[in-house]
């Protein structure tokens, strides 16, 4: 299953990065699981994950790191609390969980660049 996501995203000065993860038509998928993975070298670590259903399309991902909304086969993901050391490749993984058959797809990843804000100079 094809999963599309932007190649590059620049985090805001507050350490917030948003991107859209879009998957090939869900057909009659009723339950979808979306996972954000961070790739560092050959290792992948899970940043956040959530399952949502077509009956409850809007709010999903009630998580300290990620928030998001879904609409059809698009998921709007927001990752918060990012710092310069979190710069890296973030991969969107989508699983069509129910009803069968099970499908899984992974995007090519979104390179998120995070620049720590310069500290404010002391004012006299």
């Amino acid at each position: 299953m094809h999963v599309a996501q932007p190649a590059v995203v620049l985090a805001s000065s507050r350490g917030v990065a948003s991107f859209v993860c879009e998957y090939g038509s869900s057909g009659n998928a009723a339950e979808v699981r979306v996972t954000v993975l961070r790739q560092a070298g050959s290792q992948m670590t899970e940043v956040c994950a959530a399952t949502y259903t077509v009956e409850d399309e809007l709010a999903f991902l009630d998580d300290s790191t990620c928030t998001g909304t879904s609409s059809g086969n698009k998921v709007n993901l927001t990752i918060q609390g990012l710092r310069a050391m979190d710069t890296g490749l973030y991969i969107c993984k989508v699983e069509l969980m129910y009803p069968p058959p099970y499908y899984v797809g992974m995007g090519n990843g979104t390179q998120i660049y995070v620049i720590d804000p310069e500290p404010c100079p002391d004012s006299d």
């Epitope: 057909g27 009659n28 009723a30 699981r33 009956e55 069968p100 099970y102």
Partner: antibody, heavy 116, light 112 residues
Framework: EIQLVQSGGDLVKPGGSVRLSCKAS????????MNWVKQAPGKGLQWMGW????????TYADDFKGRFTFSLDNAKNTAYLQINSLRAEDTAVYFC?????????WGQGTTLTVSS | DVLMTQTPLSLSVSPGEPASISCRSS???????????LEWYLQKPGQSPKLLIY???NRFSGVPDRFSGSGSGTDFTLRISRVEADDAGVYYC?????????FGGGTKLELK
């Protein structure tokens, strides 16, 4: 308002064929699977199978393989159940039902009577 | 195929009294994603079934909180804390975890 309106039930002679229809409205037809459920007189509910309204792929329960065919007309937002070589034991109320992770919406049912 | 066995076949309950219906599956109905797609429906004479409970214990919108579902693995229960006249009908459990999906045989609830 989401609705499933059924039609096509009739009195048919054994050996004949019938096509029951289920017209959906109020939602995107191709987003949800359409299921068919049989209820013989005085009996319980029997799951016949479902059709993926996006791909058109049907899944049949064992008892309904062969003489039964699920089909679609997506332009009309309608699912069909065709039964061939009708037998007396096909006499029943047939329901269509929209499924996601449950069945919140059902057709009103259509009665098929097979008798000579 | 997963056989869903409901007990009792029928029960007669006075208004205000509790009622309980059991549904047992012939094998575990935990789906591969960890969810259990076990539902309860009520059918009244001449009507289509109506959804009460999904995923074992989740009440569908508009269903009174008198209805509750519980269970895991192979044993499931629908409870009505205080039966009302409108609750009469046939109750069916349904498993949507393993194809072919299957209904229980039904339990008829009558009011005394």
């Amino acid at each position: 308002e989401i609705q499933l309106v059924q039609s096509g039930g009739d009195l048919v002679k054994p050996g004949g064929s019938v096509r029951l229809s289920c017209k959906a409205s109020g939602y995107t037809f191709t987003n949800y699977g359409m299921n068919w459920v049989k209820q013989a007189p005085g009996k319980g509910l029997q799951w016949m199978g479902w059709i993926n309204t996006y791909t058109g792929e049907p899944t049949y329960a064992d008892d309904f393989k062969g003489r039964f065919t699920f089909s679609l007309d997506n332009a009309k937002n309608t699912a069909y159940l065709q039964i061939n070589s009708l037998r007396a034991e096909d006499t029943a109320v047939y329901f269509c039902a929209r499924r996601s992770i449950y069945y919140p919406y059902w057709g009103q049912g259509t009665t098929l009577t097979v008798s000579s | 195929d997963v056989l869903m066995t409901q007990t009792p076949l029928s029960l007669s309950v006075s208004p205000g009294e509790p009622a309980s219906i059991s549904c047992r599956s012939s094998q575990s109905i935990v789906y591969s994603n960890g969810n259990t797609y076990l539902e309860w429906y009520l059918q009244k004479p001449g009507q289509s079934p109506k959804l009460l409970i999904y995923k074992v214990s989740n009440r569908f919108s508009g269903v009174p909180d008198r209805f509750s579902g519980s269970g895991s693995g192979t044993d499931f229960t629908l409870r009505i804390s205080r039966v009302e006249a409108d609750d009469a009908g046939v109750y069916y459990c349904f498993q949507g975890s393993h194809v072919p999906w299957t209904f229980g045989g039904g339990t008829k609830l009558e009011l005394k």
